[in-house]
């Protein structure tokens, strides 16, 4: 029998390379049974994750899975960084792995921090 726990299917260390100025949809794949959970996005800032309250979001329902989408219209250079979605379901908080957006600003292509630096200081992303 399939579990009716809510599950969020963002892969550990997933990343997207995108261009500033383009539209982009960041998807949080959500599996649930009967009642759709309340899902939010947050953006990592240093050691904390700051809720994105005033951003456009939407749901896309498919047969076996749903997607809670964070819209970037358009992508801005400071959208660079890591994001997590979380779901509130029956008083439980379920949190996804983080997914990282690497935004290339064609006008000012800057060097991406090395993997070693990122491991040691993940908040380098938010400079």
């Amino acid at each position: 029998k399939e579990s009716c726990d809510v599950q969020l299917y963002i892969k550990r260390q997933s990343e997207h390379s995108i261009l500033a100025g383009d539209p982009f949809e960041l998807e949080c794949p959500v599996k649930y049974c009967a009642n759709r959970p309340h899902v939010t996005w947050c953006k990592l800032n240093g050691t904390t994750c700051v809720k994105l309250e005033d951003r456009q979001t939407s749901w896309k329902e498919e047969k076996n899975i749903s997607f809670f989408i964070l819209h970037f219209e358009p992508v801005l250079p400071n959208d660079n960084g890591s994001y997590r979605c979380s779901a509130n379901f029956q008083s439980n908080l379920i949190e996804s792995h983080s997914t990282t957006l690497y935004v290339t600003d064609v006008k000012s292509a800057s060097e991406r921090p090395s993997k070693d630096e990122m491991a040691s200081r993940p908040w380098l992303l938010y400079r």
Partner: antibody, heavy 126, light 107 residues
Framework: EVQILETGGGLVKPGGSLRLSCATS????????VNWVRQAPGKGLQWVAQ??????????YYAESLEGRVTISRDDSKSSVYLQVSSVRAEDTAIYYC?????????????????WGQGVMVTVSS | DIQMTQSPSVLSVSVGDRVTLNCKAS??????LNWYQQKLGEAPKLLIY???NLQTGIPSRFSGSGSGTDFTVTISSLQPEDVATYFC?????????FGAGTKLELK
Amino acid sequence: EVQILETGGGLVKPGGSLRLSCATSGFNFNDYFVNWVRQAPGKGLQWVAQIRNKNYNPATYYAESLEGRVTISRDDSKSSVYLQVSSVRAEDTAIYYCSPISSYYHDGSLHYSDYWGQGVMVTVSS
Amino acid sequence: DIQMTQSPSVLSVSVGDRVTLNCKASHNIKNYLNWYQQKLGEAPKLLIYDTVNLQTGIPSRFSGSGSGTDFTVTISSLQPEDVATYFCFQYHSWPYTFGAGTKLELK
């Protein structure tokens, strides 16, 4: 008021193991990484381990000289972090400090804070 | 590992002196360096983070500078309560490492 209390120290025999606890209150523990740092009597500071928070999976990192003998863990529901040290030897004799750290960016500037407990003494001797 | 070398290891000072403490990294650590002050029998206390930023509550007579491999902390006019040991700490790459410390003692 921020409080950090390390416990679990004392006298341990060589080859034995110990588990240090760090209980915290007065700040949002979930937003903090935690370092353990130690200081042998009359010596300098040595970084031992770090555990990140759930925003970072929560990843763990260790000093190479201690790798394989130390394990750091955390229990967010208790706002606590733990350090397990196995196969202890005389050179593990030290004061062990627990230090939660946090950072965030605002208007392009890094804001960083850390707290330190008063430390707990561990003596390894037969 | 990145080695952090502090100099001098002991410095004799007088109240009112301008004091400069040095820290040298064995590799480029950009600006990922903190300074800690430790008084006898106490836990370390963060003075400066990211090379130049004064932690809240630290007097403005303390300042930090440097980049890459060479770093300094300066006390513009030493006060009696500044007598302590000062440690630099790099968090550019694993494992994090401290310098061996510079101990200030009154002449």
